[in-house]
């Protein structure tokens, strides 16, 4: 349970100013005889809270005029060190005749509640009961800085007190500190630094990895002009006042570079025509990528050694590398660019397309009948290797009969050696159509445009075959 | 400054399990591939695994199984789980950054190529 | 697996010397160059020197040079310093597989 016990009380008012490390105990005379009767503080049980006075109750009234109520003048100003404790009070005579009067502290317009050591001493007298109201901070900081107030409810009047005003004192305090920034080789700067007491002024010095850079301080704030850097720096601000020095943060000021190359690539995948790749990207030169390049050329020693380049957005950091040769092997690059220039190339790395299936038909292709042997005989050309799209493994025959009111297609598989074939006159008196596609592993490709020849009855002979030209012999 | 700093080593049982840590700083573990690498004792360099940008992890064939690579990456930290350890194991044992790597994803393998910055080294010894 | 070999194991050279230490192997390099060399010294880890077989890496003196393709490659050093003693490794890549092979090691000693 906690004990309050009295202050000594100075005589008269105390006005003016009071500048101390220590705590200034601030009261009431004590010559007019008042004993001290009661006392609480706000964590006692049962009690009102901070500031809150209950006037014992007076039975009886005198009728002569009262005299107006104020609280008396105290110390208005004190200032003091951060982390010190201070206490200071206001105190009021009230007749006996008032009941139940409430004082509350009040800080820049606001209430002050709760947590805050509030104590209220009564000295009670045969007509009147002097109160004094202390308020103490123990380890003071910059936010209690602020004019101080107590007020009285009486009869619904309200008795306002002189303001005390505090003010804390210490190093300075920064509101605004130097930031990084990636910059351009030999391009102005600017830094900020700002700085607060009290006490004021404060100057500000600059400091450039290590060493001073202006001999002269600076009222706060201040802006450095950095001309220009070749090379990264380090940057701080020293904020000085009467109480000392405090120093800012340091700040690295980079300079923007090329960006390294990318240090990872993937290959996610491949068919005939494409390759989709990754990368991840490598360090950036302090400057946002902007686009990436993607260099691709044939591994063959025997192409022309010819590039294909890709320009893409630097995000996903995805591409797929379309247009490309079936079955082929190709080298690979990524390069990334920032607003300062490309990086250089990854090392080149290897990725094949797979087999496709072939981009055209066969070519040339010739029909006729060989009715001897009461067949159809079928030749043709091999696509150009280049739109083969892989290693063929042979042709498909696509082979329509139609006569009257009958038509039956069939299918036939013929190897990848040679390049005719010969199939069974399935119908006589009718038309016999032709297609033929090439295949690899990849697939089936188009079949050719389709070639007719006329099957005769039995006995009549037409030699003349039936053919697709060759691209350029039309 | 970029650096590696190797830890976790010292003597162990035969039979036994150790985890390894490679810390990193001044360059981030999600932006490059890592790897191991080990020294017996006297002897030659022997690789033993990496880890992608990515997390995908490639071991040589005679780590497989036993040996394990994996990261943490918001501690910026790789480690390796070394299980059955044999005397054999016995070496002072490295991790380096891939200076730059190449990913075959759909072939599950990836190429090194080159080591471009080293730790110290921490020593595994293995014996009873 | 593929296999990388250094000769000679072991080299006696005096300062000034031009050195020359080869590393073959049995099978293609990746690319056909992604071949590199680290300088290795007693209770110190490796040090890349040269990457793409003929790259030097960053801060490596230019004494150090090296070439090759394929499956035979070389590493020189044109006149050999105080410094360079040491044991030198070639490592290297292969396609269709992940393994990261390293050479047996080449020690320059002082004659």
């Known amino acids: 349970r906690e004990e309050a016990k009295p202050y000594p009380l100075f005589p008269g008012p105390f006005p003016g100013s009071l500048q101390t490390d220590h705590t200034p105990l601030l009261s009431l005379p004590h010559a007019s005889g008042y004993q001290p009767a009661l006392m609480f503080s706000p964590t006692q049980p049962g009690r009102p809270h901070t500031g809150n006075v209950a006037i014992p109750q007076v039975t009886s009234v005198e009728s002569k005029p009262l005299p107006p109520l104020a609280f008396k003048h105290t110390v208005g100003h004190i200032i003091l060190s951060e982390h010190k404790g201070v206490k200071f009070n206001c105190s009021i005579s009230v007749p006996n005749i008032y009941q139940d009067t409430t004082i509350s502290w009040w800080k820049d317009g606001k209430e002050l509640l709760g947590a805050h050591h509030a104590i209220t001493q009564f000295y009670p007298d045969d007509e009147v009961t002097a109160i004094i109201a202390s308020f103490s901070i123990t380890s003071v900081q910059r936010s209690d800085n602020g004019s101080y107030i107590c007020k009285m409810k009486i009869n619904n009047e309200e008795i306002v007190s002189d303001p005390i005003y505090i003010e804390v004192q210490g190093l300075p305090h920064f509101t605004k500190q130097p930031e990084s920034m990636n910059v351009t080789r030999n391009t102005a700067f600017n830094l900020t630094c700002q700085a607060v007491g009290p006490p004021e002024p404060v100057n500000i010095f600059w400091v450039q990895n290590s060493s001073r850079v202006n001999e002269q301080p600076e009222k706060s704030p201040s802006v450095l002009t950095v001309p220009g850097l070749t090379e990264m720096a380090v940057f701080s601000c020293e904020a000085h006042n009467d109480k000392g020095l405090t120093v800012s943060k340091g700040v690295q000021i980079n300079i923007k570079a090329i960006p390294s190359p990318p240090t990872e690539v993937s290959i996610r995948n491949s068919t005939a025509h494409s390759i989709l790749i990754s990368w991840v990207p490598g360090f950036d030169g302090y400057s946002p990528f902007r686009n990436c390049s993607i260099q691709v050329k044939e591994a063959d020693p025997l192409s022309n050694g010819s590039v294909m380049i890709f320009n893409t957005s630097a995000l996903p950091h995805l591409y797929q590398i379309k247009q490309l040769q079936a079955l082929a092997n190709y080298s690979i690059g990524v390069s990334c660019m920032n607003e300062i220039g490309w990086s250089a190339v990854s090392p080149w790395i290897l990725a094949s397309t797979t087999e496709g299936a072939p981009s055209v038909a066969p070519l040339n292709v010739t029909v006729f009948l060989n009715e001897s042997s009461d067949n159809v005989d079928i030749r043709w050309m091999k696509p150009p290797t280049k739109q083969q799209d892989g290693e063929l493994v042979g042709y498909r025959i696509s082979h329509v009969w139609q006569s009257a009111g009958i038509s039956k297609e069939l299918l036939e598989e013929v190897g990848q050696n040679g390049s005719r074939a010969r199939i069974s006159v399935q119908v006589h008196n009718a038309t016999c159509t032709v297609r033929i596609a090439a295949v690899t592993r990849g697939g089936v490709g188009p079949f050719s445009d389709p070639v007719k020849i006329f099957i005769p009855a039995h006995g009549w002979v037409d030699y003349a075959p039936s053919s697709t030209p060759a691209p350029g012999n039309a | 400054e970029q650096q590696l700093v190797e830890s976790g080593g010292g003597l162990i049982q035969p039979g036994g399990s150790l985890r390894l840590s490679c810390a990193v700083s001044g360059f981030s573990l999600s932006s490059n591939a890592m790897s191991w690498v080990r020294q017996a004792p006297g002897k030659g360099l022997e690789w033993i695994g990496i880890i992608s940008s990515s997390g995908s992890t490639y071991s040589a064939s005679w780590a497989k199984g036993r040996f394990t690579i994996s990261r943490d990456s918001s501690k910026n930290t790789m480690y390796l789980q070394m299980n059955s350890l044999r005397a054999e194991d016995t070496a002072v044992y490295f991790c380096?950054?891939?200076?730059?790597?190449?990913?075959?994803?759909?072939?599950?393998?990836?190429?090194?190529?080159?080591?471009?910055?080293w730790g110290q080294g921490t020593l595994v010894t293995v014996s009873s | 697996d593929a296999q990388l070999t250094q000769s000679p194991s072991t080299l006696s050279a005096s300062v000034g010397d031009r050195v020359t230490i080869t590393c073959q192997s049995s099978k293609s390099i990746y690319n056909n160059n992604w071949l590199s060399w680290y300088q290795q010294k007693p209770g110190k880890p490796p040090k890349l020197l040269i990457y793409d077989a003929s790259d030097l890496a960053s801060g490596v003196p230019s004494r150090f040079s090296g070439s090759g393709s394929g499956t035979e490659f070389t590493l020189t050093i044109s006149s050999l310093q105080p410094d360079d003693f040491a044991t030198y490794y070639c490592?290297?890549?292969?396609?269709?597989?992940?393994?990261?092979?390293f050479g047996g090691g080449t020690k320059v000693e002082i004659k």
């Open positions: 490592a290297g890549g292969y396609s269709g597989d992940s393994d990261y092979a």
């Open positions: 380096a950054r891939v200076g730059f790597f190449v990913g075959y994803g759909a072939y599950d393998y990836g190429i090194i190529h080159r080591l471009d910055l």
